[in-house]
């Protein structure tokens, strides 16, 4: 479906040696930065979750077709504070609407090398990938 | 180690063997209900993003040792309705706390068998995971 | 080397509440999770719940669900728990074990590696 | 929930003996098993993780077998040390369940 040619790439390859463990986040393709439009920041009665929020967001495609899940979906806050449960618009400098990240299991294909160090298929090393998922409204962090 | 002999069989095996793909969600263990307490339906000052959130939320744990990854969380609204940007505390009706879902994609270790039908180590299935992600506050839907 | 010391022992009243602390050394403390386990006087063990420290994931037994509240402060690497409305049955000594992950990636193991000294809670009126 | 149930309760031997105690899990649990020691103190420790690889510094007197829902735990040599409570648990499935506990004696 994918076309890797085959995952593992002969009997007897320890499943190790298929899913190698790295700790260390792979940032995703563009930073984060907040991307505030006036022009959208409200909350809308109807429509998806991120559009009817307070702290509304849209998603940013980010895909890789070596990397299993390919495509990944950053958020992107459209207001730096939460928008007014009453009006839907005005926007209320006592919230602030900040992303919420997640480290996310992802897997990328990688060659690999028979006992001679011939190519011999891909393998799937698993990695933390960091991923924005919503943005959220919260009070402001008072600093002790 | 965890005696799993190969994960793919033999050599050329299709990688869509190893990683079949579903698009059937497969269920949370546990309903992703609300799960309100008033002690704790609150918005802190400090703390981390999920306490601060005006529509906070607890994790809970769902462990499968044969998924990759093996720990996921689901968010539990600890409130029916946002806490008052003013407050901290006070339910303001006019919002209500949303979860958020992700049809995540997970990996479940499976038998492989080869072409005779012997067992032949173990392959990974892909498949699409519905998880809570977050609470949300957001504004109420307004039928048409 | 990994330690975990708790606090003293609590005597407490029926209806009452208990807090139980574990102090974590020797290790990364948001790197494992903490179970909490329980033993009643002359029975065996009985597991209540855990806490993952770095994102204050839980998973609690059914049977103490509404009644548990499994927290930590990272800032001190201490994790608590904390039994409401106390029975006379829930006296019982109360253990603290963090959880190993062992073998390759990427299916872990999962073991008490080290646990507490106890903590006796005894409710009585 | 998954039942452990722990045999037997208790057992009395002599220093030397090689002791066996099982444990039947109330379905497959896949070798998701674990072994801990209670010394009379309260002191508890871990034994054998995963049926049967030895946790760190543990004599390789203790080992462990099994598959499917049927486990045992085996000192092949008693030694006076040994004196304590033996607890199975699983880790197949939350919660996690411990079988009732085999009490040890010293002839």
């Known amino acids: 479906y994918s076309h890797w040619p085959s995952c593992c790439p002969s009997k007897g390859y320890p499943s190790e040696e298929l899913l190698r463990w790295s700790t260390v986040p792979v940032p995703p393709l563009k930073p984060a930065s907040l991307d505030f439009h006036s022009v959208s920041c409200r909350a809308s009665e109807d429509g998806p979750l991120n559009s009817r929020a307070i702290s509304p967001w849209r998603y940013e495609l980010d895909r890789d077709l070596n990397r299993l899940p390919q495509d990944l979906y950053h958020a992107r806050c459209l207001c730096p504070h939460c928008v007014s449960l009453q009006t839907g618009s005005h926007m209320d400098p006592r919230g602030n609407s900040e992303l919420l990240y997640h480290n996310q299991t992802v897997f990328y294909r990688r060659p690999c090398h028979g006992k001679k160090g011939n190519h011999k298929g891909y393998c799937l090393e698993r990695r933390l990938y960091r991923v924005s998922l919503a943005c959220v409204c919260v009070r402001p962090r008072v600093m002790g | 180690y965890s005696h799993w002999p190969s994960c793919c069989p033999s050599k050329g095996y299709p990688s869509e063997e190893l990683l079949r793909w579903s698009t059937v969600p497969v269920p949370p263990l546990k309903p992703a209900s609300l799960d309100f307490h008033s002690v704790s339906c609150r918005a802190s000052e400090d703390g981390p993003l999920n306490s601060r959130a005006i529509s906070p939320w607890r994790y809970e744990l769902d462990r499968d040792l044969n998924r990759l990854p093996q720990d996921l969380y689901h968010a539990r609204c600890l409130c029916p309705h946002c806490v008052s940007l003013q407050t901290g505390s006070h339910m303001d009706p006019r919002g209500n706390s949303e979860l958020l879902y992700h049809n995540q994609t997970v990996f479940y270790r499976r038998p492989c068998h080869g072409k005779k039908g012997n067992h032949k180590g173990y392959c990974l299935e892909r498949r699409l995971y519905r998880v809570s992600l977050a609470c949300v506050c957001v504004r109420p839907r307004v039928m048409g | 080397q990994v330690q975990l010391v708790q606090s003293g022992a609590e005597v407490k009243k029926p209806g009452a509440s208990v807090k139980v602390s574990c102090k974590a050394s020797g290790y990364s403390f948001t790197g494992y999770t903490m179970n909490w386990v329980r033993q009643a006087p002359g029975q065996g063990l009985e597991w209540m719940g855990l806490?993952?420290?770095?994102?204050?994931?839980?998973s609690y037994k059914q049977k103490f669900q509404g009644r548990v509240t499994m927290t930590v402060d990272k800032s001190i690497s201490t994790a608590y728990m904390e039994l409401s409305r106390l029975r006379s049955d829930d006296t019982a000594v109360y253990y603290c074990a963090r959880e190993g992950y062992y073998g390759p990636s990427p299916f872990h193991h999962y073991a008490m590696d080290y646990w507490g000294q106890g903590t006796l809670v005894t409710v009585s009126s | 929930d998954i039942q452990m149930t722990q045999s037997p309760s208790s057992l009395s031997a002599s220093v030397g003996d090689r002791v066996t105690i099982t444990c039947q899990a109330s379905q497959d649990i896949s070798n998701y098993l674990n072994w801990y020691q209670q010394k009379p103190d309260g002191t508890i420790k871990l034994l054998i993780y995963?049926?049967?690889t030895l946790h760190t510094g543990v004599p390789s007197r203790f080992s462990g077998s099994g598959s499917g829902t049927d486990y045992t735990f085996t000192i092949s040599s008693l030694q006076p040390e040994d004196i304590a409570t033996y607890y199975c648990?699983?880790?197949?499935?939350?919660?996690?369940?411990f079988g009732q506990g085999t009490k040890l004696e010293i002839k």
């Open positions: 806490i993952n420290p770095d994102n204050g994931g839980t």
């Open positions: 648990q699983q880790y197949s499935k939350l919660p996690y369940t």
């Open positions: 995963y049926t049967s």
